[in-house]
């Protein structure tokens, strides 16, 4: 099952998932001024490699392209790059079964990747840099299902500018002994969730998060 | 106090590899994001490439893209910067940083020459 | 990438002085602008931050601000340990772009 909404945002932090579970679907975007073959509208990962490879031709006329596909119409997109330079992928990529790697880029791509992630799936965060990690337990978020619903739960990861960091010891040392109450799995609460409430916003991009970087 | 050290610095030939070491102290060196910059004997700073504090993402000025790489080793508290295929416009005084350049070390010197 | 034009390029100063020098950026940055001190055969400094914020243990008689595209940087009552080259750098985004820099000299 896809997961419906983002992963939650972390102010100033981006998140990656390591693998991509099977059945994820990596939108075929190109840049201004290209085109996706129309046969290849996404990657979709099965077993543990993606279906097929994106291409994108020339497009003179720069017709603005569908960002999401008819069959995904409904659903939120899910983009966990960035909007002016992708974060390289760098070392820890997991090599498990039924899951896929990062997929590499392919010529004329979107600076922008969009992913539809599904159940059990789960995300990394990290402070971008200039931000100091006060961590309070993983910094981690995972895809589960609960009450018939998909949601995120809450990554365990404030970040502080670390220009900043001498006004932060105090909180620091507090946050660092707090211990964060697990989320209760079995209960099924009438009127809330354990998950966060989505927002308007997609997941936040790199253009978003470098805004913010030293705010 | 915090001390960030830099080595591995050398005269090395056009089209060589050269590995450069930062040793952090005195913080969480987990806790922050790192950097490198650059400065051409003479010239001004210019910005190399950033990593976030756990390693996963990793960026990168075009002109190093593809033949430079960062990366770190938390447990010995290390930033690397792995530099291939050199060119002699890579001749600079190599400085590593925090993130948020609070902290900065004393830099290394990378010369390519034949 | 977003350019980042400082000037003046070197400024002839004497004790006491004001001095103020400006960071022009192609496109904008926000506040997202940062200013470094370094004196020859050092490190850069960190001086301010976000445009306006001096940095931990930096004397007030250093300022900054702007936003949008266009920063200055201020030394109030120049002092002779205050030679150096200051350069400003966007932290708004990537690449990270530096200022050509401002060399200040005794007159």
């Known amino acids: 099952e896809l997961c419906l909404y983002d992963p939650p945002e972390v102010p100033n932090a981006t998140f990656k998932a390591l693998s991509y579970k099977n059945g994820t679907i990596l939108n075929c975007e190109c840049k201004r001024g290209f085109r996706r073959l129309k046969e290849l509208v996404y990657m979709r990962c099965l077993g543990n490699s993606w279906s097929s490879n994106c291409q994108c031709t020339s497009n003179s006329h720069d017709k603005s392209r569908k960002q999401v596909t008819a069959q995904l119409e409904h659903q939120k997109e899910q983009q966990t790059t960035t909007d002016m330079q992708k974060p390289t992928q760098s070392m820890h990529q997991e090599n498990l079964t039924g899951h896929c790697r990062e997929p590499p880029p392919w010529k004329h791509e979107d600076s922008k990747r969009i992913y539809h992630f599904v159940e059990g799936q789960s995300v990394h965060y990290e402070c971008i840099p200039g931000y100091k990690a006060l961590q309070r337990g993983p910094a981690i978020s995972i895809c589960k299902m609960k009450c018939g619903k998909t949601g995120w739960t809450q990554p365990q990861l404030t970040c502080v500018d670390e220009r900043e960091h001498h006004r932060f010891l105090a909180s620091e040392e507090s946050q660092g002994s707090r211990n964060s109450s697990p989320e209760s799995e079995t209960s099924c609460p009438i009127t809330t969730t354990d998950f966060p409430q989505p927002t308007e916003t997609t997941a936040m991009t790199e253009t978003f998060v470098l805004t913010m970087e030293y705010k | 106090e915090v001390q960030l050290v830099e080595s591995g610095g050398g005269l090395v030939q056009p089209g060589r590899s050269l590995k450069l070491s930062c040793a952090a102290s005195?913080?969480?060196?987990?806790?922050?994001?790192m950097a490198w910059v650059r400065q051409a004997p003479t010239k001004g700073l210019e910005w190399v490439a950033s990593i976030t504090n756990g390693g996963l993402n990793t960026y990168y000025r075009d002109s190093v893209k593809g033949r430079f790489t960062i990366s770190r080793d938390n447990a010995k508290c290390t930033l690397y910067l792995q530099m291939d295929s050199l060119r002699s416009e890579d001749t600079a005084t190599y400085y590593c940083?925090?993130?948020?350049?609070?902290?900065w070390g004393q830099g290394t010197l990378v010369t390519v020459s034949s | 990438d977003i350019v980042m034009t400082q000037s003046p390029t070197s400024m002839s100063i004497s004790v006491g002085d004001r001095v103020t020098m400006n960071c022009k950026a192609s496109q904008n940055v926000d506040s997202n602008v940062d200013w470094y001190q370094q004196k020859t055969g050092q490190s850069p400094k960190l001086l301010i931050y976000?445009?306006?914020n001096r940095y931990t243990g930096v004397p007030d008689r250093f300022t900054g601000s702007g936003s949008g595209t266009d920063f200055t940087f201020t030394i109030r009552n120049m002092q002779a340990e205050d030679l150096a080259v200051y350069y400003c750098m966007q932290s708004n985004s990537y690449p990270l772009t530096f200022g050509s820099g401002t060399k200040l000299e005794i007159k």
């Open positions: 940083a925090t993130g948020g350049f609070s902290f």
């Open positions: 005195g913080f969480t060196f987990s806790d922050y994001g």
């Open positions: 976000k445009a306006s």
